[in-house]
Each structure stands twice: as C-alpha cells, then as structure tokens.
C-alpha cells in the first residue's frame, strides 16, 4: 500500500513539475527590467527564451520573436536545449510511469517489469529535473553577469550633456517557476526510484526441489556442487535461477560432516 502511495505521489509530483517546466520554457518573463531605481516606468521590458516583449504603461504590449538562430548567444541556445531535453525526458518518463503504476493493470504485466519501468521513469524524472534546474541556473548566472556589467557603465554621457540610461535586467518569474518545477520533478523522480525498490517482487520462483530430512534440511541443486545444511540456509526465499548457480553472497556455506571437498 505504501509502495503504491509512494509511486502515485511520485507520479503526481513529477507531473506537476513537468507541467511547470513546460510553463517556464514558454513564459516570456525569464528576465525583466530592473525597477530598483525607478519603480514606476512608462516602458517595461521583459524577455523570454523565444521572444522579447515591451509593455507600455498605457496598456499596449508588443512582443517580437527571436527569428535568428545563429545570431543568438550560445548561452541562450544552451538554456533552450537544456529545457527542451528536460521536457522531452519528462514527457517520456510520464508515459513510461503511467504503464508502471501499480494501480493500473495492463494485460499480464509482471511486477518485475513494472519495477523496471518505475525505475526508468524515476531516473528520467531526475535527469529532467536536473536539466531544468541547470538551464534556469545558467540563465540566472548570465543575468547576474550582465547586471553587474551594465551597472558598471550604467550612465554613458554624451559630452556630459545627455544621459543614456542603460536598461538592466533582473530575474523574471519564469526562473522561479523553473527552479520550483525542476525541484518537484527531481523529488518525484526520487520517489519513483524509492517505490521501485518496494515493487521488486519477492522470490518465489524456485527451480530447485527441496527435500526435508529430520535433523538437517538438505537442498539438492541440479548442477550445483555444494549442499547447504539447515544451519546455513537463508531464511529469505531467494530466487534460484536456471542451473542453480548462486553468487558467494547468496549462499553461505558452513562446514559440516556432509561437506566433501
């Protein structure tokens, strides 16, 4: 029950996160005009990943797309790429996780397959969240760098007579949406990975024939060279694969009078 809840909650949290990443990517307010020195402005500038906008105080808003691809800064292209990769991975993760949900029955899908799918989607969500956080952080770093550069030469005088005020940009709403959304997707992914551990099926698929004798319980393993005594047998039911071969960790062998080398 707890596993189903963890998986379901992970799915919902990731869904919200990916919706947020998509929203952030589409938003125009990645950077907004800094209004620190002038809280009331007649012309307000803001920029997104895909277009820049100007909102005039009278109500008119005009947006212009970045119609050039080669003319754009490499950092902006990198941020676009990170956000798109995040969305794509998140979308695939959502698709996979829908089929992996324990509450949904699809044919005769085994729990082991669901566990694998849950883990896959969890990893995808984690990478998706990291991509979004990285993208937003790269953009934020770019803004901080440009902000201090423009502050350094904020007023460029023309013969000391005319002032040209350089527009400075600060963090827009999209950055905060992106950070939160990326974080949620990451958390959702971790929850899916945790749920995966609980979904891993108990070992019941035995290919060995057990013979129970009084005093010692001896398991005959076809193809195996050792017999475990009752003292050394694992209390947990571990899956024995074809051939009965196990790793040293799986079978502890204790010396007894039945052991022959």
């Amino acid at each position: 029950m707890a596993v189903t809840a963890c998986q379901g909650l992970g799915f919902v949290v990731s869904l919200i996160g990916i919706a947020g990443i998509i929203a952030a990517t589409c938003m125009d307010q990645w950077s907004t005009q800094d209004l620190y020195n002038n809280p009331v402005t007649a012309v307000f500038n803001y920029q997104g990943l895909w277009r820049s906008c100007v909102r005039e105080s009278s109500g008119f808003t005009e947006c212009r797309g970045y119609f050039t691809l080669l003319g754009l800064p490499a950092m902006l292209q990198a941020v676009r790429a990170l956000m798109i990769v995040g969305i794509v991975l998140g979308a695939i993760g959502l698709l996979v996780s829908i089929f992996a949900l324990k509450c949904i029955r699809i044919g005769s899908m085994e729990d082991s397959a669901k566990a694998n799918m849950t883990l896959t989607s969890g990893i995808m969500f984690i990478v998706s969240g990291l991509c979004a956080i990285a993208g937003v952080s790269v953009f934020a770093n770019m803004l901080v760098t440009n902000f201090w550069m423009s502050t350094a030469n904020m007023y460029t005088g023309m013969g000391g007579m005319v002032q040209t005020v350089q527009t400075r940009y600060t963090f827009g709403a999209a950055l905060f949406v992106g950070w939160v959304a990326g974080g949620l997707t990451l958390i959702g992914g971790v929850m899916m990975c945790i749920a995966c551990r609980g979904l891993a099926p108990e070992e019941t698929n035995y290919k060995a024939v057990s013979y129970h004798a009084s005093g010692h319980s001896v398991a005959y393993k076809p193809g195996g060279f050792k017999a475990s005594t009752g003292f050394g047998s694992n209390t947990k039911n571990k899956k024995i694969y074809d051939g009965g071969a196990r790793t040293e960790d799986e079978v502890q062998s204790y010396p007894s009078k039945h052991d022959y080398v």
């Epitope: 007649a42 012309v43 500038n45 105080s57 009278s58 109500g59 005009e62 040209t164 005020v165 527009t167």
Partner: antibody, heavy 118, light 113 residues
Framework: QVQLQESGPGLVKPSETLSLTCTVS?????????WNWIRQPPGKGLEWIGY???????NYNPSLKSRVTISRDTSKNQFSLKLSSVTAADTAVYYC???????????WGQGTLVTVSS | DIVMTQSPDSLAVSLGERATINCKSS????????????LAWYQQKPGQPPKLLIY???TRESGVPDRFSGSGSGTDFTLTISSLQAEDVAVYYC?????????FGQGTKVEIK
C-alpha cells in the same frame, strides 16, 4: 471610435477644489488604455496631469501629485479629475485624452476652460 | 524630468515648400527592448484639441497625410512637412513618452510666408 467629453464648472474660486468629469463613448473605460488629463494654460504649452489605466492604477505628474486625484466610475463609463487648493495658475483648458501605443495620446476631448477667480 | 526643447519657436514657409521642426530631449528616448524611440508629434489648430500625427518617432498615425514624416533617434528628432498646405497652419508639439512625467515641447508655430 472612442469619443471623449469633458464636463464641469467653468469657474472655481481660489483654494477650492476643481472637479471635472470625462465621459467615454464608443469604448469601455475598462479596456486596455490609459485615461489621461492634460491641461493647457491660455496661450501656453501642454502639461500632462496624470492618468488612470485599465486596471485602475493611477500615475500623476510629481509637480501636481499632492493636489491631484484621478478616479473612475466603470458603471457610468466615466473618469474624473479633482485638483485641490487651486490658484490662478491653475486656470487652463483641461483635456481628457486616451493613450495607447507608444504611450501617445490618440483620442482627445474638446477641452473645457476652467477659470480660477474669486 | 525630461526636458523637451523645440526649435524654432515659429516658422514661416511658402505653400508647397518643406517645413522642418526640430525637437531635442535632455535624455535618450530610445528603448533598448524594442529599439523604438518614445516620441510623438501633435498638431494643434486654434480652438481645437491637439491631434496625433506621429508616434514612436517615425510611425504615422492612420489618416495622417503622408506629407508628414518623423525621423531621428536618441535625443534629436525632426518633424518634416514635405509640401506645406494651407490647412497645415498650426502649432506643433513634440512629446516624450519614455519616462514619467510625460512632457511636451514648448511648441512651434507654423505659418505661411
């Protein structure tokens, strides 16, 4: 097309409050414009007083800010100007105007002359 | 406040001739976000309210004859009437709309020589 018409008393006594109303027709006062008041003393240039925008936010000329109030009545599709403690220097033709693209005044009222005299 | 200074104060031009009015601002009116200059030109005839001719320094308002044109960027702007007509006799004002408070030039009176 938006049409504007100013109304109010033509004569106001010094130290009293000047009150003018602008009635908007052919458009809604809640639409995406700013609704301005501008004045022009006889034989002189134009001075922007302030505006109330589509969301009800007001912005005033700092030189008049302490004396000016611009408000609106969406039910009557009107906006109004109140200028307190008037003096003879406030004698002017008062215009209401709509600003939009380029923050430019695209529609104007005919104007109303307000004289401040005792 | 941004101070707008127009020159000349008055201008007498023959019919059919070119009339040029200059407007200078104390600060740049160029917005980096859209590369537009926030300057408008108005025409005011006696007893009438001003009429918008040009906005964004060079965009002609609809219904305005194409003999009116605006140019300039940053701090220096020009209104040109390519061929003066009798009905163009008026006072012309420039207005900055980039920074509050919005301010007007003192006006330029255009007359027929």
């Amino acid at each position: 097309q938006v049409q504007l018409q100013e109304s109010g008393p033509g004569l106001v006594k010094p130290s009293e409050t000047l009150s003018l109303t602008c009635t908007v027709s052919g458009g809604s006062i809640s639409s995406n414009y700013a609704w301005n008041w501008i004045r022009q003393p006889p034989g002189k240039g134009l001075e922007w007083i302030g505006y109330i925008n589509y969301s009800g936010y007001t912005n005033y000329n700092p030189s008049l800010k302490s004396r000016v109030t611009i408000s609106r009545d969406t039910s009557k599709n009107q906006f109004s100007l109140k200028l307190s403690s008037v003096t003879a220097a406030d004698t002017a033709v008062y215009y209401c105007a709509t600003s939009y693209y380029g923050n430019s005044f695209i529609y104007w009222g005919q104007g109303t002359l307000v004289t401040v005299s005792s | 406040d941004i101070v707008m200074t127009q020159s000349p104060d008055s201008l007498a031009v023959s019919l059919g001739e070119r009339a040029t009015i200059n407007c200078k601002s104390s600060q740049s009116l160029l917005n980096s976000g859209n590369q537009k200059n926030y300057l408008a030109w108005y025409q005011q005839k006696p007893g009438q309210p001003p009429k918008l001719l040009i906005y964004w320094a060079s965009t002609r308002e609809s219904g305005v004859p194409d003999r009116f044109s605006g140019s300039g960027s940053g701090t220096d702007f020009t209104l040109t009437i390519s061929s003066l007509q009798a009905e163009d006799v008026a006072v012309y004002y420039c207005q900055q709309a980039y920074s509050f408070p919005w301010t007007f030039g003192q006006g330029t009176k255009v007359e027929i020589k």
